[in-house]
């Protein structure tokens, strides 16, 4: 059997694992001492519950869901995490001035439960 990828949230709209955007300043992120730009980042992250087989990434996530129902104190529910990322370029301080650096795992692009 393969992992099912249910997209219906039984908890109600917006309650299950999804992409969420938070606007954050360099100060909010603790980056002000090494990043110069951008001064504000639209941080995309994965937030929400992972009930039943909702967006199960693989068979392991399905097993985790089943065992969590049986032994909630021992087995945690699957977690909502990025399935892929959007890259981002930062202008950052260096010993000699400034430079560009590309980060390929900074912003979530889409989410699943694992």
């Amino acid at each position: 059997a393969r992992a099912r990828n249910g997209d219906h949230c039984p908890l109600g709209p917006g309650r299950c694992c999804r992409l969420h955007t938070v606007r954050a300043s360099l100060e909010d992120l603790g980056w002000a001492d090494w990043v110069l730009s951008p001064r504000e980042v639209q941080v995309t992250m994965c937030i929400g519950a992972c009930p039943s087989q909702f967006r199960a990434a693989n068979m392991h996530a399905q097993i985790k869901t089943s065992l969590h129902r049986l032994k909630p104190d021992t087995v945690p529910a699957p977690c909502c995490v990025p399935a892929s990322y959007n890259p981002m370029v930062l202008i950052q301080k260096t010993d000699t001035g400034v430079s560009l650096r590309t980060y390929d795992d900074l912003l979530a692009k889409d989410c699943h439960c694992i």
Epitope: P38, E40, Q42, P87, I91, D104, L107
Partner: antibody
Framework: EVQLVQSGAEVKKPGESLKISCKGS????????IGWVRQMPGKGLEWMGV????????IYSPSFQGQVTISADKSISTAYLQWSSLKASDTAMYYC????????????WGQGTLVTVSS | QSVLTQPPSVSGAPGQRVTISCSGS????????VNWYQQLPGTAPKLLIY???NRPSGVPDRFSGSKSGTSASLAITGLQAEDEADYYC??????????FGGGTKLTVLG
């Protein structure tokens, strides 16, 4: 509507100086980086450098470091590309382009400024 | 010589499917993303595909991008006369310089 409007074509002699401009409108000018791209006649695109108009931080491609200067005046939403001493090999079309939200691609482009350097 | 390698030209008849390749290395396409630009004759480049496979609004779904390993491809289906243009791929190299492919001239036959 996002627009980048560049200054008109220029014909210069070797050794002369030049400053071309790129005026942004329809968006918050200080919230997006501006890049400059060169296209020599019949050739491809070459990235020259980038400026953050909000903080005036500039970074140049090693190929163009020391050859040109990129600047911006945020009070009039305009970025600039300048040469102190032009060479015949600077003859090209120069484009300004706005970086997308993540700084990884160019989502809007100016119409280009043709610079011709000839004695 | 460009860091990213594209074929100088490709051609196809109206209605056909054509692909344009963009070959890089483990220091650019291999670990990062690819964007594609279309430059119609006498005009400025225009963003066609970003982050490998995303289309900006207004770009027809006849255009699609993909990436595998250190190569990327742009596919155009249902080729139209107005698709005749130069196409450029773009990524970054290991020192975070923005790099372009040499460009591919697409000719629509007929």
């Amino acid at each position: 509507e996002v627009q980048l409007v560049q200054s008109g074509a220029e014909v210069k002699k070797p050794g002369e100086s030049l400053k071309i401009s790129c005026k942004g409108s329809g968006y918050s000018f200080t919230s997006y980086w501006i890049g400059w791209v060169r296209q020599m006649p019949g050739k491809g695109l070459e990235w020259m450098g980038v400026i953050d108009p909000g903080g005036s931080y500039t970074i140049y491609s090693p190929s163009f470091q020391g050859q040109v200067t990129i600047s911006a005046d945020k009070s009039i939403s305009t970025a600039y590309l300048q040469w102190s001493s032009l060479k015949a090999s600077d003859t090209a079309m120069y484009y300004c382009a706005r970086y997308g939200r993540y700084g990884t691609y160019f989502d809007y482009w100016g119409q280009g400024t043709l610079v011709t350097v000839s004695s | 010589q460009s860091v990213l390698t594209q074929p100088p030209s490709v051609s196809g008849a109206p209605g056909q499917r054509v692909t344009i390749s963009c070959s890089g290395s483990s220091s650019n396409i291999g670990v990062l993303y690819v964007n594609w630009y279309q430059q119609l004759p006498g005009t400025a480049p225009k963003l066609l595909i970003y982050s490998n496979d995303n289309r900006p609004s207004g770009v027809p779904d006849r255009f699609s991008g993909s990436k595998s390993g250190t190569s990327a491809s742009l596919a155009i289906t249902g080729l139209q006369a107005e698709d005749e243009a130069d196409y450029y791929c773009q990524s970054w190299d290991s020192s975070s310089n923005y790099v372009f492919g040499g460009g591919t001239k697409l000719t629509v036959l007929g």
